[in-house]
Interface confidence: medium
């Protein structure tokens, strides 16, 4: 499993992971106490046939070509959690691990 | 976590799981001994904002709206393996569990 890493200066048009820092304060998400900012990353780019396909399934659907199947898109294929301090629904402040907050790898699926 | 299930008669335009039977013989994939056909399913449909978003990350990227982020697309969010009998690259016949061959759920990511 591998994926491309890019930055704002990259000329890569294919599916790639780009850096993105999310700022909760800028969003007005005041129920999140910490971190106020974190490195989330995101996926962007084109998915030419077979490039960075995570699953054999993606290839099979392309072969079968059913009605309405749009072809693969550039999406997170590996994500990781972060620890956060936040208000839960009961107005308690909780320290907890929130899954799938960081994109570690992008691919076509 | 939930996802929509549709069939060929559905009028649903949103991201949905559709039935798809993959036929390896029809593809000419003769290195797969068994199964010759299996129910793979696929994802198709529109991802309006917040609908069926698997990860909070998807929402955050939408909020941050970085250059080139294309918005979420309808993609498998839960997959399962199948057991297969197949020739490997060394002409050995192997019985093994192949991951991510069946789409169990679709969502927007």
């Amino acid at each position: 499993d591998f994926g491309l890493d890019c930055d704002e200066h990259s000329t890569e048009s294919r599916c790639c992971r780009y850096p993105l820092t999310v700022d909760f304060e800028a969003f007005g998400w005041d129920w999140i106490i910490a971190p106020k900012r974190y490195k989330a990353n995101y996926c962007s780019g084109e998915c030419e046939f077979v490039f960075l396909q995570k699953y054999p399934h993606t290839h099979l659907v392309h072969q079968a070509n059913p009605r309405g199947s749009a072809g693969p898109c550039c999406t997170p294929t590996k994500m990781s959690p972060i620890n956060m301090l936040y208000f839960n629904g009961k107005e308690q402040i909780i320290y907890g691990k929130i899954p799938a907050m960081v994109v570690d790898r992008c691919g076509c699926s | 976590d939930f996802g929509l299930d549709c069939d060929e008669h559905s009028t649903e335009s949103r991201c949905c799981r559709y039935p798809l039977t993959v036929d390896f013989e029809a593809f000419g994939w003769d290195w797969i001994i068994a199964p010759k056909r299996y129910k793979a399913n696929y994802c198709s449909g529109e991802c309006e904002f917040v609908f069926l978003q698997k990860y909070p990350h998807t929402h955050l990227v939408h909020q941050a709206n970085p250059r080139g982020s294309a918005g979420p697309c309808c993609t498998p969010t839960k997959m399962s393996p199948i057991n297969m009998l197949y020739f490997n690259g060394k002409e050995q016949i192997i019985y093994g569990k192949i991951p991510a061959m069946v789409v169990d759920r679709c969502g927007c990511s």
């Epitope: 106020k36 620890n83 909780i94 | -």
Partner: antibody, heavy 125, light 107 residues
Framework: QVQLVQSGPGLVKPSETLSLTCTVS??????????WGWIRQPPGKGLEWIGT???????YYNPSLKSRVTISVDTSKNQFSLKLSSVTAADTAVYYC?????????????????WGQGTTVTVSS | DIQLTQSPSSLSASVGDRVTITCRAS??????LGWYQQKPGKAPKRLIY???SLQSGVPSRFSGSGSGTEFSLTLSSLQPEDFATYFC?????????FGQGTKLEIK
């Protein structure tokens, strides 16, 4: 590295307001990974978290003290302060300031490190 | 609030001894617990974070274990500089709360 130096009176009269300041050196109080807190320790007793602030002014207080506590930040002076109103003898304690560190990767957090040197505050007339 | 109960409240031991201090939480706090050492007239110093991770620069004779509601701090071979008071801290639910402390004295 970051160091915290406390200042403020050691004696406060009952019903008055206790005021302490913590000056940060070796780092910016406006660092988005840093949070700034106060803890106290009555004589011969355990530690009690009072509250925590972020440089933007967002504050979180211990409910047991919330009605009497104000924590504020002065980014221009690189310091933050504690005010505790309507004090009684039960507020006699050693007061500490401390930093919390939250890494922006979300993987590593560090509570109460480093600490200030501590200020002994006696409430007495 | 989550209560942390430390035991024993005081302990006498000799240099070279192995000692264990326990901390019991009033509800499940996963592994969101730290251990601190405090010497007279000084600010506390963190020894252990996330229940079992050793703070950088802390000697390996200190170790932490546990999760949920039962935690312990073990000193494998006491050194003269280890005689101090030890506190546990939970950082799972605000307000953060500390144990009442265990005073480790020289026998």
């Amino acid at each position: 590295q970051v160091q915290l130096v406390q200042s403020g009176p050691g004696l406060v009269k009952p019903s008055e307001t206790l005021s302490l300041t913590c000056t940060v050196s070796g780092g910016s109080i406006s660092n988005s990974n840093y949070y700034w807190g106060w803890i106290r320790q009555p004589p011969g007793k355990g530690l009690e978290w009072i509250g925590t602030t972020y440089y933007s002014g967002t504050t979180y207080y211990n409910p047991s003290l919330k009605s009497r506590v104000t924590i504020s930040v002065d980014t221009s002076k690189n310091q933050f302060s504690l005010k505790l109103s309507s004090v009684t003898a039960a507020d006699t304690a050693v007061y500490y300031c401390a930093r919390d560190y939250y890494d922006s990767s979300g993987y590593y957090y560090n509570w109460f490190d480093p600490w200030g040197q501590g200020t002994t505050v006696t409430v007495s007339s | 609030d989550i209560q942390l109960t430390q035991s024993p409240s005081s302990l006498s031991a000799s240099v070279g001894d192995r000692v264990t201090i326990t901390c019991r939480a009033s509800q499940d706090i996963r592994n969101d617990l730290g251990w601190y050492q405090q010497k007279p007239g000084k600010a506390p110093k963190r020894l252990i974070y996330a229940a079992s991770s050793l703070q950088s620069g802390v000697p390996s004779r200190f170790s932490g274990s546990g999760s949920g509601t039962e935690f312990s701090l073990t000193l494998s071979s006491l050194q003269p500089e280890d005689f101090a008071t030890y506190f546990c801290l939970q950082h799972h639910i605000y307000p953060w709360t500390f144990g009442q402390g265990t005073k480790l004295e020289i026998k």
